[in-house]
Interface confidence: low
């Protein structure tokens, strides 16, 4: 299953399949997730090692047992690939690294006013993979405000150096934020020229395109079909690039198919997995296991559950079957693609779904970096779990926020439904940033069931929590995916990086905001909070957040929305915006329902009819 824990001061010994430089452990984990053989990783921060060559070293590892011996190494961080982790799987990495220069091939230099502008330029350049920005205080005046766009053969920096007044980061193309746009067309009987960056075997052009999309240097591809004239070249998928970013020429050629990477698509990227099953096809590779199962779908599920399995063949040969079960061959290769593809067989083949991010399990999401008073505008995909709860009586209006916690579940505040318990007046909008973007044609979810905590009473602050079951499950995308729930009774974790988001008022007597707002707010102890609210009982089932001096807070319209905290690179839903005395007043923190205290209730209510929990806490 999905293992999200990180091991500090530990290094996995042996099992190396690749190494690279990455700015932090989270990026290293992402590279491990997308590497076909990587199950474990170890990362060496700059502070952990004197050897300059190994600083920022990211070591990707494989193990037939799924684990490796851990040795103590001060400062090192190790962990697991996020294969099988559903919606946590994303190549999107938004972080900016201060005081770090990520080296690569510098192919473009320009003057810009901020690191955000530099990141935007990188995201809008087809060849840019990462960038470095020299700030206004950089020691050499002529380099100040320089934005260097970079690439490298592997898509990761060729070296990372500690350098004052330099900030670095990655292109946000994998976040589906590129302004370039993409070519969805597939060109039959056409071969593209230019440089081949890799070759793999695929059963069709669509798998070839997905592999191209997630390959660091592939911009376009040519696929040779299974009836291509040269037998040894059949099913070859050539991943290609060029200096200009587009094919310099194309040749009409029977039985070839060409197309483009979809990495530059805006708002939607293909999933990094291949779900189609290919009847009459055998996939060759290294044998991992052979098991008897009933049906090709069970074979695919078996492959998906066995983390090292990359693809499979289900044989229907009489000698491979007994009763209703037939042999399911679980296989792998060095590059994640079959080493041989044979047609006209009595088998059916396909791929593991371990990198699909629409899996049933709602495990924690780690990927993504509130009107809120004193807040700032959010950007696309920054808070993909945030939803807007709107009421349509006569005019439609935003009333509350909420958090997506599963394909069919939203967590919000009970008081949002005071006087409005009718489920058919509510519309739930997910995957949006600007309320003004909502038109009559914008898709929304309807409510199947409102589950208000049984101990909640109107006009009381206690047990201010409610679950919404949606009529239809939502698909996960970079802009619409769930937030991780905390562990039951989570009291030991000290959260230092917490944010509240919402479209609520920007001042006490204000109005709903158009752009989703965010504000960074520190947590306050319950003892401190109780001192500020002597007329109310601050219980252990509440959590408070706010600045002593005020100025930043949630406000009307933010209710029900998330208070999220980032810990070990993972976002968790710590609180639900509930109540407070006014908004952003001095020494009057906001009060939030403490989600960890309600985990039993949430899990009980979200049990599906077949008895499996729809939600899952971090491992």
């Amino acid at each position: 299953g999905c293992l999200t824990q990180l091991y500090e001061n530990a290094f996995f010994r042996g099992g190396d399949v690749a190494s690279m430089y990455t700015p932090n452990a989270q990026y290293c984990q992402m590279r491990c997730t997308f590497h076909p053989r990587c199950l474990l990783f170890s990362f060496l921060p700059a502070s952990s090692i004197n050897d300059m060559e190994k600083r920022f070293g990211c070591f990707l590892k494989d193990s037939v047992t799924g684990t490796l011996p851990k040795v103590h190494r001060t400062g090192a961080v190790s962990g697991h690939s996020l294969k099988q982790c559903g919606h946590q799987i994303s190549a999107c990495h938004r972080d900016i690294y201060k005081g770090v220069d990520m080296r690569g091939v510098n192919f473009n230099v320009s003057k810009v006013s901020s690191v955000e502008e530099c990141q935007k330029r990188c995201t809008s350049n087809i060849r840019c993979q990462f960038f470095s920005y020299a700030t206004q205080t950089f020691h050499k005046a002529e380099y100040r405000n320089n934005c260097l766009l970079k690439y490298s053969p592997g898509g990761t920096p060729t070296a990372i150096k500690v350098l004052s007044n330099v900030e670095s980061g990655f292109s946000l193309k994998p976040c589906a934020l590129s302004e370039i746009g993409c070519h969805m067309n597939i060109f039959q009987h056409l071969a593209f020229s230019d440089v081949d960056v890799a070759r793999v075997l695929t059963p069709d052009a669509f798998v070839c395109r997905t592999i191209c999309t997630y390959h660091p240097n592939c911009l376009f591809f040519t696929f040779y079909t299974n009836v291509w004239k040269i037998e040894s070249q059949r099913n070859v998928c050539l991943l290609k690039t060029s200096e200009s970013g587009t094919p310099s020429s194309s040749t009409p050629q029977e039985n070839t198919i060409s197309g483009y990477s979809l990495l530059t698509c805006k708002r939607t990227l293909p999933e990094p997995c291949h779900s189609k099953i290919y009847p009459g096809v055998d996939f060759g590779g290294e044998e991992l296991n052979v098991t008897f199962v009933k049906g090709v779908n069970v074979c695919q599920e078996t492959c998906t559950k066995m983390i090292r399995c990359q693809f499979f063949t289900y044989s229907l040969l009489p000698e491979d079957c007994k009763e209703e079960k037939c042999k399911c061959f679980l296989r792998l290769s060095m590059d994640g693609s079959p080493t041989r593809i044979a047609y006209g067989t009595q088998g059916s083949s396909g791929y593991s779904l371990r990198l699909c991010n629409t899996g049933d399990n709602s495990v924690c999401t780690t990927k993504t970096s509130t009107r809120i008073v004193g807040g700032t505008n959010s950007s696309w995909g920054e808070w993909p779990w945030q939803v807007s709860l709107q009421v349509k009586l006569t005019a439609q209006r935003h009333l509350c926020g909420g958090s997506l916690i599963g394909h069919q579940w939203v967590l919000t505040a009970a008081h949002c439904f005071d006087g409005l318990p009718l489920q058919d007046v509510w519309r739930i909008y997910s995957g949006i940033l600007n309320l003004s973007d909502i038109t009559k044609d914008t898709p929304f979810s309807q409510i199947k069931e409102i589950i208000i905590h049984q101990n909640y009473k109107v006009s009381e602050g206690n047990h201010d929590i409610a679950l919404i079951k949606l009529q239809a499950p939502l698909n996960y995308t970079e802009f619409q995916k769930p937030i991780c729930l905390p562990s039951k009774g989570d009291t030991s974790t000290i959260y230092t990086n917490c944010w509240v988001t919402g479209w609520g008022f920007s001042k006490e007597k204000g109005e709903i905001q158009n752009i989703l707002q965010k504000v960074n707010i520190p947590l306050v102890t319950n003892e401190e909070c109780q001192k500020r609210y002597q007329d109310y009982k601050i219980t252990q089932r509440m959590v408070c957040a706010g600045y002593k001096e005020g100025g930043k807070d949630a406000c009307k319209g933010d209710s029900g929305g998330p208070l999220v905290c980032k810990h070990n690179g993972m976002w968790r839903l710590v609180g639900i915006t509930s109540w407070g005395e006014g908004c952003a007043r001095r020494e009057q923190p906001g009060v939030y329902t403490k989600v960890a205290e309600y985990m039993d209730w949430i899990l009980e209510k979200t049990q599906s009819s077949d008895g499996k929990a729809q939600m899952q806490s971090p491992a």
Epitope: V17, P153, A191, S193, V195, R199, Q233, S248
Partner: antibody, heavy 118, light 107 residues
């Protein structure tokens, strides 16, 4: 029968130029990427340059980048290598080779000797 | 660039011997390795492509194996005409690179 025949080699002074040709026959020349590979006396094989089937894209080894130019004329079934600013270390037998889909060189010419010496 | 390290650099063997030559890539390259035979004054000849596929017209005593970083060319029963220099080459990425060569001599 596939045949590749190189020509144009010879003795040249450092800093001089030469143009190698490779005449192809026995296959549809315009469908295959082509390459130049060289072997210096007593040394191993070194890839020099490649050109796509249409001639639209070219790549070079770092050691010759900016000095050598690969080109092809599909109407004449001929591959070329223009070598400028020649150096003593460019002395080698130069082979033209056809590239099959997996990047192997399935047919080679007999080679032409280029000697750069004063 | 991907380095291809070939060993041994030379070997001497009897006719009928089984001979193996290895090639190690500096990074993982799937199965994109090709093997060539080169005799002095002649054009090199492709023996094996894609690590293990036998080029048409090449005798079946030649075989290739390996994937990732380690590759082997095996001649199951050495014949007089097999005495030559053998090269491996990676075609995983540009620039294409060759191993240093193995000189197979008659003992």
């Amino acid at each position: 029968e596939v045949q590749l025949l190189e020509s144009g080699g010879g003795l040249v002074q450092p800093g001089g130029s030469l143009r190698l040709s490779c005449a192809a026959s026995g296959f549809t020349f315009s469908q295959y990427p082509m390459n130049w590979v060289r072997q210096a006396p007593g040394k191993g094989l070194e890839w020099v340059s490649s050109i796509s089937s249409s001639g639209g894209f070219t790549t070079y080894a770092d050691s010759v980048k900016g000095r050598f130019t690969i080109s092809r004329d599909n109407s004449k079934n001929t591959l070329y290598l223009q070598m400028n600013s020649l150096r003593a270390e460019d002395t080698a037998v130069y082979y033209c080779a056809r590239e099959e889909q997996q990047g192997g060189f399935d047919y080679w010419g007999q080679g032409t000797l280029v000697t750069v010496s004063s | 660039d991907i380095q291809m390290t070939q060993s041994p650099s030379s070997l001497s063997a009897f006719v009928g011997d089984r001979v193996s030559i290895t090639c190690r890539a500096s990074q993982t390259i799937s199965v994109y390795v090709n093997w060539y035979q080169h005799k002095s004054g002649q054009a090199p000849k492709l023996l094996i492509y894609g690590a293990s596929s036998l080029q048409s017209g090449v005798p079946s005593r030649f075989s290739g194996s390996g994937s990732g970083t380690d590759f082997t060319l095996t001649i199951s029963s050495l014949q007089p005409e097999d005495f030559a220099t053998y090269f491996c080459q990676q075609s995983y990425s540009i620039p294409f690179t060759f191993g240093g060569g193995t000189d197979v001599q008659i003992r």
